[in-house]
């Protein structure tokens, strides 16, 4: 699989994807904020 995330539980895999999505959204917001502040 693409980024080295490995788990034997499908629900755990889905949770990892949800966390990744959340972090991407948070980091994306921070990045946009930094650009705006510049």
């Amino acid at each position: 699989h693409s980024d080295g995330i490995f788990t034997d539980s499908y629900s755990r895999y889905r949770k990892q994807m949800a966390v990744k999505k959340y972090l991407a959204a948070v980091l994306g917001k921070r990045y946009k904020q930094r650009v705006k502040n510049k």
Partner: antibody
Framework: EVQLVQSGAEVKKPGSSVKVSCKAS????????MHWVRQAPGQGLEWMGL????????RYAQKFQGRVTITADESTSTAYMELSSLRSEDTAVYYC??????????WGQGTLVTVSS | DIVMTQSPDSLAVSLGERATINCKSS???????????LNWLQQKPGQPPKRLIY???TRESGVPDRFSGSGSGTDFTLTISSLQAEDVAVYYC?????????FGGGTKVEIK
């Protein structure tokens, strides 16, 4: 209501590859877990793998590791399953399916792939 | 991989009678999140499978209440309380708890 429409039947030679498409409508494609399942004639169902389009993250069944590639094009809400080094045992109907509650709630109509010399 | 064993392979039942299909997994399907991802599919000839029951006992919307699912851990049952002509199909159990996701071999339900 989610709808999955798959590409048409294919006839392939042993050793070649096949690429089947699955176009989704009526849902959030990027945030769906798209699976591929196959069914040989008169046989049961076999899970091949999945993709989570938002991150293009794939998981493949051990049996197909190295021979299957699942991709997704978010711009067209289409998933693809490519199977290489085809042999006669790969003759099957290939289905895409979208997960809800770790259960396949929506299925494509199926694509028959025939491998014959 | 988790092995899903269905029994019987085929079943002939009179209209209005009860049909019972068993499904056994080689390992518990209870996940760490407290849910059990055991599902049942119905497949009619020439059609894709259709979700019937998920999370052991939750009926898909539109599925008649004569269909019910039960069980826990490794042992599960699909019951059709009063068989109708339109229930003739192959039924599959499958598990979505562990990778690789795996299916039972199917049970063909016919009318006696």
């Amino acid at each position: 209501e989610v709808q999955l429409v798959q590409s048409g039947a294919e006839v392939k030679k042993p050793g070649s590859s096949v690429k089947v498409s699955c176009k989704a409508s009526g849902g959030t494609f990027s945030d769906s877990y798209m699976h591929w399942v196959r069914q040989a004639p008169g046989q049961g169902l076999e899970w091949m793998g999945l993709i989570y389009p938002i991150f293009a993250d794939q998981r493949y069944a051990q049996k197909f590791q190295g021979r299957v590639t699942i991709t997704a094009d978010e711009s067209t809400s289409t998933a693809y399953m490519e199977l290489s080094s085809l042999r006669s045992e790969d003759t099957a109907v290939y289905y895409c399916a979208i997960d809800q509650d770790a259960s396949f709630a929506y299925w494509g109509q199926g694509t028959l792939v025939t491998v014959s010399s | 991989d988790i092995v899903m064993t269905q029994s019987p392979d085929s079943l002939a039942v009179s209209l209005g009678e009860r049909a019972t299909i068993n499904c056994k997994s080689s390992q518990s399907l209870l996940d760490s999140d407290g849910k059990t991802y055991l599902n049942w599919l119905q497949q009619k000839p020439g059609q894709p499978p259709k979700r019937l029951i998920y999370l052991v006992s939750t009926r898909e919307s539109g599925v008649p209440d004569r269909f019910s699912g039960s069980g826990s851990g490794t042992d599960f049952t699909l019951t059709i309380s009063s068989l109708q002509a339109e229930d003739v199909a192959v039924y599959y159990c499958w598990q979505g708890t562990w990778f690789d996701l795996t299916f039972g071999g199917g049970t063909k339900v016919e009318i006696k």
